[in-house]
Amino acid sequence: LQDPCSNCPAGTFCDNNRNQICSPCPPNSFSSAGGQRTCDICRQCKGVFRTRKECSSTSNAECDCTPGFHCLGAGCSMCEQDCKQGQELTKKGCKDCCFGTFNDQKRGICRPWTNCSLDGKSVLVNGTKERDVVCGPASAGFSPGTSSVTPPAPAREPGHSPQ
């Protein structure tokens, strides 16, 4: 025998209290598929979240982060504070990258400048808090024969990050 609830379209639910007739989802709830016995509560975009798409009877609300924050997680389930380039986020707030480290994003952490000399190269452009160094041609006295294999990752000196 066919389940009478299977006839209930998205935006409704199969109401057991009313002989399994299809009732519209109450305000602030939705059902995105047919045949549902309950409607789901709409997501509320509060605090650092802001509404990107309003909830409707057939689809949930969608949130993103308020300016100064960026999304993390599926469907922007988390918001994390932005910093400026050249900074990283600590529990005490945004801190400048320490000398010898950089961050070219508004999120994430500082990482050490590339050590050009470990690759047999010289520094062409100095690094800053926002940018890595640019390595130039091989330094004088460096013979390609001394290092035939280029490391797969940039060689770095360990940096020191703010607490």
Epitope: L72, E80, T90, K91, G108, I109, R111, A153, S161
Partner: antibody, heavy 116, light 109 residues
């Protein structure tokens, strides 16, 4: 949508080498850290190390430094974890995860079994 | 590196409050994050940056962090909360992430 898809389960013998992969999609792979996490059978999570795919800068947990190598190929949005000589004690589930502190997306895990 | 210590197991009756501690030297100076892991699944964030709850995580989950202890609290625990829970922190000394040893939460009955 964001996804991290890991390579399939591996069965290896002690002393063999292995490279497992983690392919990212649905986001700017180059600009987010990828971490690797080990979970031995019936045990807890252990952070192994991380890589910034944009320039392949890596850093490792002291416990895993010299034991494994983390690498990435940003042109195909893939991070790797490799061993040059496996031991029976490397038997574990290995997860890749996006991030360095908050791990917001995880791969499905790669089960590595090392047995003679 | 900082070491994070969690009780191996915590048991709670349905509807009661479960508290899982995570101890480490001055962990209150860093952000603590909490992950839930169910058998055969990858971990999921339930609390991030000490006390923030991702959308989709029930309101009964909350967190705090000060001094040497971070705490995950589950109020009105339900059977579906039975899982392993891990705390973690990122330390700017050594640039490393550390996980606690994990706590198995058992919901009785």
């Amino acid at each position: 949508q964001v996804q991290l898809v890991q390579s399939g389960a591996e069965v290896k013998k002690p002393g063999e080498s292995l490279k497992i992969s983690c392919k990212g999609s649905g986001y700017s792979f180059s600009t987010y850290w990828i971490s690797w996490v080990r979970q031995m059978p019936g045990k807890g999570l252990e952070w192994m190390g991380k890589i910034y795919p944009g320039d392949s800068y890596t850093n490792y947990s002291p416990s895993f430094q010299g034991q494994v190598t983390i690498s990435a190929d940003k042109s195909i949005s893939t991070a790797y974890l490799q061993w040059s000589s496996l031991k029976a004690s490397d038997t574990a589930m290995y997860y890749c995860a996006r991030g360095y502190g908050i791990f917001d997306y995880w791969g499905q895990g790669t089960l590595v079994t090392v047995s003679s | 590196d900082i070491e994070l210590t969690q009780p191996p197991s915590v048991s709670v009756a349905p509807g009661q409050t479960a508290r899982i501690s995570c101890s480490g030297d001055n962990i209150g100076d860093q952000y603590a994050h909490w992950y839930q892991q169910k058998p055969g699944q990858a971990p999921v964030v339930v609390i991030y940056q000490d006390k923030n709850r991702p959308s989709g995580i029930p309101e009964r989950f909350s967190g705090s962090n000060s001094g040497n202890t971070a705490t995950l609290t589950i109020s009105g625990t339900q059977a579906e909360d039975e899982a392993d829970y891990y705390c973690s922190t990122y330390t700017f000394v050594g640039f490393t992430t550390v996980f606690g040893g994990g706590t198995k939460l058992t919901v009785l009955g």
